[in-house]
């Protein structure tokens, strides 16, 4: 019967006793940077070309005996997971292997850098179709390795990497911490994070998504028909490389940003038990398990958005945190979050010709996060409209006044350490959805966008009694672009988007007491693109 991992990534409409997705990734070449491989294993023979690239350190220990099957174990298994004819994800994808890990699975940053350069040169000499580079390795944070990944990604190559098996923040490792790389954590058959001895999968904001990574059946280098079960984030990354190959084979013109957004969009949502992660990492770690799209075509009409968390600002009074979108993405809204609740809001600002989301810590605060909502919006023209503090009792307001511009997000930022929270919340006058409303002592920032066929609406959910969390979701066919809290409550820790749901978090109810100021309202801005939908219908 079908291995659990292949069943897990397969949408229900393709489920059968055998895994036979519609397109095997035949137009895509996957580069594997790993150990040597047993290329004559019947699972991968004829599918994997072993390049002459080899850059590995000496094995440790004088008593180490090289045994071919052990040297090839990791790479052979991963090649099988990506494109194996029996237990592979992208059965049609061709692969090229580069040896950057020795027989003990150890490599060097320099060896990996030279390997990436080898791929870049190969791409220049003989341009082929879409390229996916699988980096099933993790080492300490390396600015130079991250930069090399960025260069290759900007040349149009899709890089997929393992989050690492250290039960730690993936941002502390490379290439997992490189924003341009698709970083993959590992889950098991129960959709739980993978435990590996005393350690396990890495987690945190640098992980893009999770994928099957425990008891993964694949080619064993022991013999030509041998199979073995292996576990780890390398196996998880191999699944995503295979899914990426299939998506790119179906839509070869997809950019890295489009591919990443699709991987996120088609993932299984909220299936991972977050209790496994350290408490401070739960909100930062995506609750996503990779899956193939239900159809390889026709996703183009959707407005895709993802949430990008910044690094923690640190606790100093003037500390700020910045969240950035990828080059091909539009920043449609900006929010902030602080566990202590002490923050001075957030704002969108231009940096290097592109909008970024900046959050501000407050005196006595333990630090803040900036949260960017990054979307794919072709032909978009977005700008930020700001209203300074109003000082009037009605609060601060700003709206999108340009013709054809719609409101996609609201941010508020204040200089005072503590807003006058004794005032009741300001309510938005009905029939004026195209404006942001904020506290009178705050400056308000409206993200206003013009794009063909773009329409947005505001959706609110208010709870009169204090609650630790208030949510409001966009309905089917609409995409969450903006998430904020209505002003006037002291205990709001911040707001952030989780998939298509806006989450407003408050302080522990027991500490705030149940006063009239306890009301919390979550405000979602939901958008869709009629233009993209029409374009899609014309193509079909």
């Amino acid at each position: 019967s079908i291995p659990w991992n292949l069943e897990r990534i397969t949408p229900p409409r393709y489920r059968a006793d055998e895994y036979q997705p519609p397109d095997g990734g035949s137009l895509v070449e996957v580069y594997l940077l790993d150990t040597s491989i047993q290329s004559d294993h019947r699972e991968i023979e004829g599918r994997v070309m072993v390049t002459d690239f080899e850059n590995v350190p000496e094995e440790d220990g004088t008593r180490f005996h090289r045994q071919a099957s052990k040297c090839d174990s990791h790479g052979t298994h991963l090649a099988g997971v990506v494109s194996g004819r029996d237990a592979g994800v992208a059965k049609g994808a061709s692969m090229r292997s580069l040896r950057v890990l020795n027989c003990q699975g150890k490599g060097t940053v320099s060896g990996t850098l030279i390997g990436l350069e080898f791929i870049r040169k190969s791409q220049l000499v003989q341009p082929v179709g879409p390229l996916v580079v699988l980096l099933p390795l993790a080492g300490g944070y390396s600015r130079v390795l991250n930069a090399a990944c960025q260069r290759l990604a900007r040349a149009g190559v899709v890089l997929v990497t393992a989050a690492g098996n250290f039960r730690d923040d993936a941002c502390l490792y490379s290439p997992a911490s490189a924003p341009e790389v698709i970083t993959v954590g590992a889950t098991n058959a129960q959709d739980q994070p993978v435990t590996l001895g005393t350690l396990g999968t890495n987690f945190g904001r640098c992980v893009d998504l999770f994928a099957p990574g425990e008891d993964i059946i694949g080619a064993s280098s022991d013999c030509s028909t041998c199979f073995v079960s292996q576990s780890g984030t390398s196996q998880a990354a191999a699944h995503v490389a295979g899914i990426a190959a299939m998506m790119l084979s179906a839509e070869p013109e997809l950019t890295l940003a489009e591919l990443r957004q699709r991987l996120i969009h088609f993932s299984a949502k909220d299936v991972i038990n977050e209790a496994w992660f350290p408490e401070d990492q739960r909100v930062l770690t995506p609750n996503l398990v990779a899956a193939l799209p239900p159809s390889t075509h026709g996703a183009g009409w959707q407005l895709f958005c993802r949430t990008v968390w910044s690094a923690h600002s640190g606790p100093t009074r003037m500390a700020t945190a910045v969240a950035r979108c990828a080059p091909d993405e539009e920043l449609l809204s900006c929010s902030s979050f602080s566990r202590s609740g002490k923050r001075r809001g957030e704002r969108m600002e231009a940096q290097g010709g592109k909008l970024v989301c900046r959050a501000h810590n407050a005196f006595g605060g333990e630090g803040v996060y900036a949260i960017a909502r990054c979307c794919l919006l072709p032909q978009a023209n977005c700008s930020v409209h700001t209203a300074p503090p109003a000082e009037a009792s009605m609060g601060t307001r700003v709206h999108c006044h340009q013709q054809g511009h719609v409101l996609t997000g609201c941010s508020s930022h204040w200089e005072v350490e503590d807003l006058g929270t004794h005032k009741p919340p300001v309510l938005r006058p009905r029939g004026q959805p195209n404006q942001c409303v904020g506290h009178r002592e705050a400056s308000i920032h409206a993200s206003c966008c013009h794009a063909p066929g773009l329409e947005c609406k505001v959706k609110e959910h208010g709870i009169p009694a204090p609650q630790e969390q208030v949510t409001v979701a966009c309905e089917e066919g609409w995409t969450l672009t903006g998430c904020s809290a209505l002003p006037g409550t002291s205990h709001v820790l911040g707001a952030y988007a989780v998939d298509n749901t806006c989450v407003v978090r408050s302080r522990d109810v027991s500490t705030t007491g149940s006063t009239s100021e306890g009301a919390v309202t979550a405000v979602a801005i939901c958008c869709r693109s009629r233009h993209l939908a029409q374009a899609s219908q014309e193509l079909q």
Partner: antibody, heavy 119, light 113 residues
Framework: QVQLVQSGAEVKKPGESLKISCKGS????????ISWVRQMPGKGLEWMGM????????SYNPNFQGQVTISADKSISTAYLQWSSLKASDTAMYYC????????????WGQGTLVTVSS | DIVMTQSPDSLAVSLGERATINCRSS????????????LAWYQQKPGQPPKLLIY???TRESGVPDRFSGSGSGTDFTLTISSLQAEDVAVYYC?????????FGQGTKVEIK
């Protein structure tokens, strides 16, 4: 039920070409390997080679490489063994058999095709 | 290539008696990654195709009578018919399926004494 059905016996002259077939049914044909096994009169079993119908990947026993061609048409769940120029020494019973990655032994065999090459 | 050698070439056993066939491979077919022996046993009766009896050296195929058993590991294997029946008259082959080319033993002919 799961079965492999082979084409009928053939009598040929040396130098002639021949293509025999093996049709699978009752299972997902593209997800199993099909091997061909020769048994010369009164002799043992010799593995000739195999094909994976899913992508037409083939692997041959070096003793048979260049002597025969293994192919498949997955649209009709059929594998083939062919000779471009038969020799008298090709006289034998030919069996097809299937195997799977999780069970890499021959669990189902065809009934056999007797090929007689004589002038 | 892995060479498979069976002994004896032929064997005559009385009905109800035990029949033992040995098979030796020129290199080990036991693999550490899954601790399995990549060895199978087949039975071929006159005018019929071979039939799978035992795989992974000791696992009986469904529908095969329990008088048939396989044992051994690494390079030395045994097929045992605990109580020979008239319908067991056949040629028995061992086969390694770990590396290509796949190879069979030369066969052992079992007859009734």
């Amino acid at each position: 039920q799961v079965q492999l059905v082979q084409s009928g016996a053939e009598v040929k002259k040396p130098g002639e070409s021949l293509k025999i077939s093996c049709k699978g049914s009752g299972y997902s044909f593209t997800n199993y390997y099909i091997s061909w096994v020769r048994q010369m009169p009164g002799k043992g079993l010799e593995w000739m080679g195999m094909i994976y119908p899913g992508d037409s990947y083939t692997s041959y026993n070096p003793n048979f490489q260049g002597q025969v061609t293994i192919s498949a048409d997955k649209s009709i769940s059929t594998a083939y063994l062919q000779w471009s120029s038969l020799k008298a020494s090709d006289t034998a019973m030919y069996y097809c058999a299937r195997d799977h990655w999780s069970k890499p032994f021959f669990d189902i065999w065809g009934q056999g095709t007797l090929v007689t090459v004589s002038s | 290539d892995i060479v498979m050698t069976q002994s004896p070439d032929s064997l005559a056993v009385s009905l109800g008696e035990r029949a033992t066939i040995n098979c030796r491979s020129s290199q080990s077919v036991l693999y550490s990654s899954n601790n399995k022996n990549y060895l199978a046993w087949y039975q071929q009766k006159p005018g019929q195709p071979p039939k799978l009896l035992i795989y992974w050296a000791s696992t009986r195929e469904s529908g095969v009578p329990d008088r048939f058993s396989g044992s051994g590991s690494g390079t030395d294997f045994t097929l045992t018919i605990s109580s020979l029946q008239a319908e067991d008259v056949a040629v028995y082959y061992c086969q390694q399926y770990s590396s290509f080319p796949i190879t069979f033993g030369q066969g052992t002919k079992v007859e009734i004494k």
